[in-house]
Structure formats: structure tokens, C-alpha cells
Interface confidence: low
């Protein structure tokens, strides 16, 4: 009798193939697209998730004003190159040899160039601002209840250490969640804020990445919190390098 489970699946990533060929006959899972072994006790890196997604069949006062250097992911989906640890490679290129530099969450941070473009290092996204607008409710949510529920969600569902949830702002109907995680703060085993934000984004869109779990059912004191739009801003440790043409557009 081996330690393999009957239901050999990956709870934290449905975009995997699993078989009981790990040590002791236990379940081991590999990400679709890359074939990389993944750690199913925690979140899979955004790079591997994007790669798996691309390989799948196609069918005001208290609110934070995003910095002028904040990035929004306007480029949408692409098939990324991931390093052996599952992180984004600093330089990404498409099939037509168009290349660009990305940050640690895979968002473009330079103008597009050709194969001669150099991206010296993977710049860390250390501050993520998740901007949500919730559907109308009878009254505003209690701020402290909302704060506690969102912190609980990131701690329990995404296993993000509470110290990385810097703040939760609320000015009906806008909710802002600030995640902060410097390179020096992130210890081995800590979930990356970029990965947590991506799982949250997919949950909010009703596209949960968790295996077999129901979709996200967010409630504050029993009252459903339904999100009607999401914007995510990414701030890097080094400001992005775009030409003036783009900045004035």
C-alpha cells in the first residue's frame, strides 16, 4: 500500500496533470504547457499559470491614487517564458521576434523592441493596488468588517502572510486592497503578492484556479460582496522605462 491518494489532483491548480509517481508513490503534479513539477500545497506561480492557460484549448479621500509609475496590464494574455523556478524571465518575446521587458508579475515595463533588447534583471513588483467596485447594496459595508474579511480571505484562501496585506481602503462602492512585499521581506515559502493577486483576480472573474472548490463566495457579515469591475495597478521597485510618446498618449 503506497501513500498515493485515490484522488490524485492538485487542490491549488486545476491546470495540471497528476499521477502517483512522486516519492513514496505519492501524488505528483505537473503544470500544463511547461510540464514543470508544481508544489500543490501553495499557489502556482503566475508565469506557469499563464503558460498553462495559453496551452489549454481556446474555446477619492481615503482611496489611494496610483502612482504615476503604476502599471496596468493592458497587453492581456501572452505565452510567457518562465525560468526553472517558475518565475517570469525578464525578457519576453513573441513568435515574430518582438521583445519587451517584464516585471515579476509578467507585466510589460518597457517599450517593445527587437531581439537586441536587453533586460538586465527581473524587476520586482513590490506594491500591488487592487481596485474593486462592488455592486450596489442596501447600505455601505462596515469598513472594519470588510477589512477583516478580505484579510482573512488572503490569509486562508491564498495563504498570504497577513503582514503583506498593507491596507484595505473603502469608499462606497470602491474597495482598494494594498499588497506590499519587498524583496527583503519575502522569506522562503512565502506566497508572492503577485501570485496571490492573480488568483484573486481569477476568483473575482469566476474563473477559480482551485481544483474542485466552489467559486469565491465573498460575504461580509452574511451580506454578499459582488464585484462588478476590477483594476489592478502594479508598482515596481525600479520605475518602468517607457518612451515619452507612450506617456503622453
Amino acid at each position: 500500500h503506497t501513500a498515493a491518494q485515490d484522488n490524485c489532483t492538485c487542490p491549488t491548480n486545476k491546470m495540471t496533470v497528476c499521477s502517483p509517481d512522486g516519492p513514496g508513490g505519492r501524488c505528483q503534479c505537473r503544470a500544463l504547457g511547461s510540464g514543470m513539477a508544481v508544489d500543490c500545497s501553495t499557489l502556482t506561480s503566475k508565469c506557469l499559470l499563464l503558460k498553462a492557460r495559453m496551452s489549454a484549448p481556446k474555446n477619492a479621500r481615503t482611496l489611494v491614487r496610483p502612482s504615476e509609475h503604476a502599471l496596468v496590464d493592458n497587453d492581456g494574455l501572452y505565452d510567457p517564458d518562465c525560468d526553472p523556478e517558475g518565475r517570469f524571465k525578464a525578457r519576453q518575446c513573441n513568435q515574430t521576434s518582438v521583445c519587451w521587458c517584464v516585471n515579476s508579475v509578467g507585466v510589460r515595463r518597457t517599450d517593445k523592441g527587437d531581439l537586441s533588447l536587453r533586460c538586465d534583471e527581473l524587476v520586482r513588483t513590490h506594491h500591488i493596488l487592487i481596485d474593486l467596485r462592488h455592486r450596489p447594496t442596501a447600505g455601505a459595508f462596515n469598513h472594519s468588517d470588510l477589512d477583516a474579511e478580505l484579510r482573512r480571505l488572503f490569509r486562508e484562501r491564498y495563504r498570504l502572510h497577513p503582514k503583506f496585506v498593507a491596507a484595505v481602503h473603502y469608499e462606497q462602492p470602491t474597495i482598494q486592497i494594498e499588497l506590499r512585499q519587498n524583496t527583503s521581506q519575502k522569506a522562503a515559502g512565502d506566497v508572492d503578492i503577485g501570485d496571490a493577486a492573480y488568483y484573486f483576480e481569477r476568483d473575482i472573474k469566476g474563473e477559480s484556479l482551485f481544483q474542485g472548490r466552489g467559486g469565491l463566495d465573498l460575504r461580509v457579515r452574511g451580506e454578499p460582496l459582488q464585484v462588478e469591475r476590477t483594476l489592478i495597478y502594479y508598482l515596481d521597485e525600479i520605475p518602468p522605462k517607457f518612451s515619452m510618446k507612450r506617456l503622453t498618449a
Partner: antibody, heavy 119, light 112 residues
């Protein structure tokens, strides 16, 4: 929140079968495995066995011939049966939830129930 | 079966000083696929169930003070308490989960 609670008779006679129940709440029995661990008075921890989320079981090879772990999903209960007990089976018995797909760690434990084997 | 050997059996350390506990496994606990070591550390205080401190050999469980750290790979592992506090008096156990589960014999940490 996640909770586990062991229950059962505190006293069992030698050669009889020890039967304990672990009642769980706050999580799905089909998503997590539950382990049984025991600790004789003043001694260390000994893993007894596990029922994986899929329903299969594994046992400590030293106890395998005497142990059975089962589940009653309608009652959210796991049970442990240890046959032909002796004084050496006197211990605090804990149930603990697997915190991982392959059971790498136990983050949630019951408070334990003390079982004494004596005539 | 994998055998886990802890040393020392007991340890007396002054408040604020470093405490180091060793754990040795009879075979490697490193999964080359996921590059993870299947080793956890637990703390048990009298009359209480064990509490998870460290998993994957070096990952600190949420809420565990950062004075606790785990290190090592393969067959040799260490739990370090960088600055012992009064509330750290307890028995500490390592546990392998590479092939089913085995606990080490425990190390009792006391104040000198």
C-alpha cells in the same frame, strides 16, 4: 473555522478493541485527509495512520495488523479502531488534519483524548 | 521505514540565547521534482497538542514568530530559535512526510 474533536471511552480493558471518534467541522472531508497520532504519557509522538481525502488509508507498519481507520461522511466523523490492546497502548490520542495534498504537515489538531488500558 | 533521529534529547539555554535542535533522517527527504524537503517541525507545550512551526524544512507557518527558523536539506535538518523566550519552553519534534510519516523522538528545551 476548522475544528477537530476526539472522543471515546477513557478506559479500555486489555485484549479489547479501542474505538475513538474524531468529529470535524469547518472543512470538507473530500478535500483533506485526517491522521491519527498518539503519545504515551511522558513519551514522544507516534503516527498511527491516515485516511486520505480520496478514502484510501495508510497505517504505521508496526500497528498495521491491529488498526482500522474509517469515515462516516454523513456525520463528519473519522473513527479509529485498535484491536487487542495492551498497557503499551495507553496514550493521549490525537486526530490532525492534513494541510496538504500529499500530507506534508498537520496544521490543525484536536485537543486529544486520553485512553488508559487497564483491567 | 524512515527513521528520524533528533539531538540533543534536552537542551538548557539562557533567555535571549540561541537554541539549536538537530534532526537526521535515515534517507533523503528531498523531492527532486518539486525541490522540496518533506520535513516539518512542531512545538508541544505541556497539556497541549503539537503546534506546527515549520514545513518544507524552512517555511514558517503563518503566525509563528520569526525567531523560529528551519534549515537543511536531504538528511540533515536544524531548527533554530534565535533568541529564546520564556514561552518557548516546550518539546520540539521533527517529522518526515517523504514516505508516510515518522516523528523524531523530541527535544526538550528548558531555560538555563
Amino acid at each position: 473555522q476548522v475544528q477537530l474533536q476526539e472522543s471515546g471511552p477513557g478506559l479500555v480493558k486489555p485484549s479489547e478493541t479501542l474505538s475513538l471518534t474524531c468529529t470535524v467541522s469547518g472543512f470538507s472531508l473530500t478535500s483533506y485527509g485526517v491522521n491519527w497520532i498518539r503519545q504515551p504519557p511522558g513519551k514522544g509522538l507516534e503516527w498511527i495512520g491516515v485516511m486520505w481525502a480520496g478514502g484510501s488509508t495508510n497505517y504505521n507498519s508496526a500497528l498495521m495488523s491491529r488498526v482500522t481507520i474509517s469515515v462516516d461522511t454523513s456525520k463528519n466523523q473519522f473513527s479509529l479502531k485498535l484491536s487487542s490492546v495492551t498497557a503499551a497502548d495507553t496514550a493521549m490520542y490525537y486526530c490532525a488534519r492534513d494541510e496538504n495534498w500529499d500530507g506534508a504537515w498537520f496544521a490543525y489538531w484536536g485537543q486529544g483524548t486520553l485512553v488508559t488500558v487497564s483491567s | 521505514d524512515i527513521v528520524m533521529t533528533q539531538s540533543p534529547d534536552s537542551l538548557a539555554v539562557s533567555l535571549g540565547e540561541r537554541a539549536t535542535i538537530n534532526c537526521k533522517s535515515s534517507q533523503s527527504l528531498l523531492n527532486s521534482g518539486t525541490r522540496k524537503n518533506y520535513l516539518a517541525w512542531y512545538q508541544q507545550k505541556p497539556g497541549q497538542p503539537p503546534k506546527l512551526l515549520i514545513y518544507w524544512a524552512s517555511s514558517r507557518e503563518s503566525g509563528v514568530p520569526d525567531r523560529f527558523s528551519g534549515s537543511g536539506s536531504g538528511t540533515d535538518f536544524t531548527l533554530t530559535i534565535s533568541s529564546l523566550q520564556a514561552e518557548d519552553v516546550a518539546v520540539y519534534y521533527c517529522k518526515q512526510s517523504y514516505n508516510l510519516f515518522t516523528f523524531g523522538g523530541g527535544t526538550k528545551v528548558e531555560i538555563k
